[in-house]
Interface confidence: low
């Protein structure tokens, strides 16, 4: 496996101001070893591992305001440890493809 | 950047448990790319239950297979082609 912490840029949207700020953070990316069982035993747990967080912390950033909107605080998750493990569907949207970490609904991106 | 060379590609390999001399059972195994990151606001808005993290993943699965019966009467899949595609058993 080669699932590891990777530097990424995430976009944090300030919806009421129609802009995003970009933040450099760490998240998980890489390759995980999986196999497709030849004998499908209903009683046997089937586990496919994905590159996801093992430990995470939350960081808070001040997002600047605009015209009639004050600055606000935005809290986002940061991975501190990665592994090839089950996707925790309670906290995670387990999908084939999402919008990507730096998706911004608006044209303007502030550094 | 994560290195593909650290992990063997998703391919057919012999399954030692169900294979017999002259009658190999092949199984898809190997690595596929996945990543996780904070869920963008746009995605959160479409969720009934908001999830803070998005995990994009594909798994090494059989694209095609033949069903065969092996010793002991077990019905198994003899995989004939593999690909990195939708993971079905990766959620807890």
């Amino acid at each position: 496996n080669s699932c590891e912490l990777t530097n990424i840029t995430i976009a944090i949207e300030k919806e009421e101001c129609r802009f995003c700020i970009s933040i450099n953070t760490t998240w998980c990316a890489g390759y995980c070893y999986t196999r497709d069982l030849v004998y499908k035993d209903p009683a046997r747990p089937k586990i496919q591992k994905t590159c996801t967080f093992k430990e995470l912390v939350y960081e808070t950033v001040r997002v600047p305001g605009c015209a009639h909107h004050a600055d606000s605080l935005y809290t986002y998750p940061v991975a501190t440890q990665c592994h090839c493990g089950k996707c925790d569907s309670d906290s995670t949207d387990c999908t084939v493809r999402g919008l990507g970490p730096s998706y911004c609904s608006f044209g303007e991106m502030k550094e | 950047a994560p290195d593909v060379q650290d992990c063997p590609e998703c391919t057919l390999q012999e399954n030692p448990f169900f294979s017999q001399p002259g009658a190999p059972i092949l199984q898809c195994m190997g690595c596929c790319f996945s990543r996780a990151y904070p869920t963008p606001l746009r995605s959160k808005k479409t969720m009934l239950v908001q999830k803070n993290v998005t995990s994009e993943s594909t798994c090494c699965v059989a694209k095609s297979y033949n069903r065969v019966t092996v010793m002991g009467g077990f019905k198994v899949e003899n995989h004939t082609a593999c690909h990195c595609s939708t993971c079905y058993y990766h959620k807890s």
Epitope: T9 | E9, C10, C31, F33, K63, A81
Partner: antibody
Framework: EVQLQQSGAELVRPGTSVKISCKAS????????LGWVKQRPGHGLEWIGD????????NYNEKFKGKATLTADTSSSTAYMQLSSLTSEDSAVYFC???????????????WGQGTLVTVSA | DIVMTQATSSLSASLGDRVTISCSAS??????LNWYQQKPDGTVKLLIY???SLHSGVPSRFSGSGSGTDYSLTISNLEPEDIATYYC?????????FGGGTKLEIK
């Protein structure tokens, strides 16, 4: 050796459609995303969208939604792009290109086809 | 969309020269940048991926560097076969976008 062989040049009338192909060889077709890129003189390279033949998943550049339709035939390891309601703006060279990471749309394009020239003219 | 700018559209250099081609992004792209070479016959090849990693089969005279919004491709000892147009491309955020290209010519 990875190869992407594209179909030949097309001369088409405005308002019609054209379907160009990209035949892949030298790798497992279903394991890699295949993208399409447009090149017009003076306009550089533009990413149109991509397709994952292993599941039929597609992703489009907003600019090309409704213009381009991406499909793949896994039995012949061939990807297709159909362009509809053609205008002179669609006259360009179109490339198919494969991603470097198996199972991932990430990472740009490691291998490129030779390009297909589409000319839209009355 | 992230706008990729290659300020120099054409560049003239002599054989054996060290040539640097630059590319800037309209926002930080976390090193998610590739460099491509397009020969006069239209053939496109990946040279450098993830800012500085050399793609297999690419001569070691090609190198890449940069961070944040500013990136560059360097050819340390210009050879006749390096005559081509060079494009940068970001894969940090969809849609993937390319620079306008820098055409390299021999003096």
């Amino acid at each position: 050796e990875v190869q992407l062989q594209q179909s030949g040049a097309e001369l088409v009338r405005p308002g019609t459609s054209v379907k160009i192909s990209c035949k892949a060889s030298g790798y497992t077709f279903t394991n890699y995303w295949l993208g399409w890129v447009k090149q017009r003189p003076g306009h550089g390279l533009e990413w149109i969208g991509d397709i994952y033949p292993g599941g039929g998943y597609t992703n489009y550049n907003e600019k090309f939604k409704g213009k381009a339709t991406l499909t793949a035939d896994t039995s012949s390891s061939t990807a297709y792009m159909q362009l509809s309601s053609l205008t002179s703006e669609d006259s360009a060279v179109y490339f198919c290109a494969r991603t470097p990471l198996y199972g991932s749309s990430y990472g740009g394009f490691a291998y490129w086809g030779q390009g297909t020239l589409v000319t839209v003219s009355a | 969309d992230i706008v990729m700018t290659q300020a120099t559209s054409s560049l003239s250099a002599s054989l054996g020269d060290r040539v640097t081609i630059s590319c800037s992004a309209s926002q930080g792209i976390s090193n998610y940048l590739n460099w491509y070479q397009q020969k006069p016959d239209g053939t496109v090849k990946l040279l450098i991926y993830y800012t500085s990693s050399l793609h297999s089969g690419v001569p070691s005279r090609f190198s890449g560097s940069g961070s944040g919004t500013d990136y560059s491709l360097t050819i340390s000892n210009l050879e006749p076969e390096d005559i081509a147009t060079y494009y940068c491309q970001q894969y940090s955020k969809l849609p993937w976008t390319f620079g306008g290209g820098t055409k390299l010519e021999i003096k």
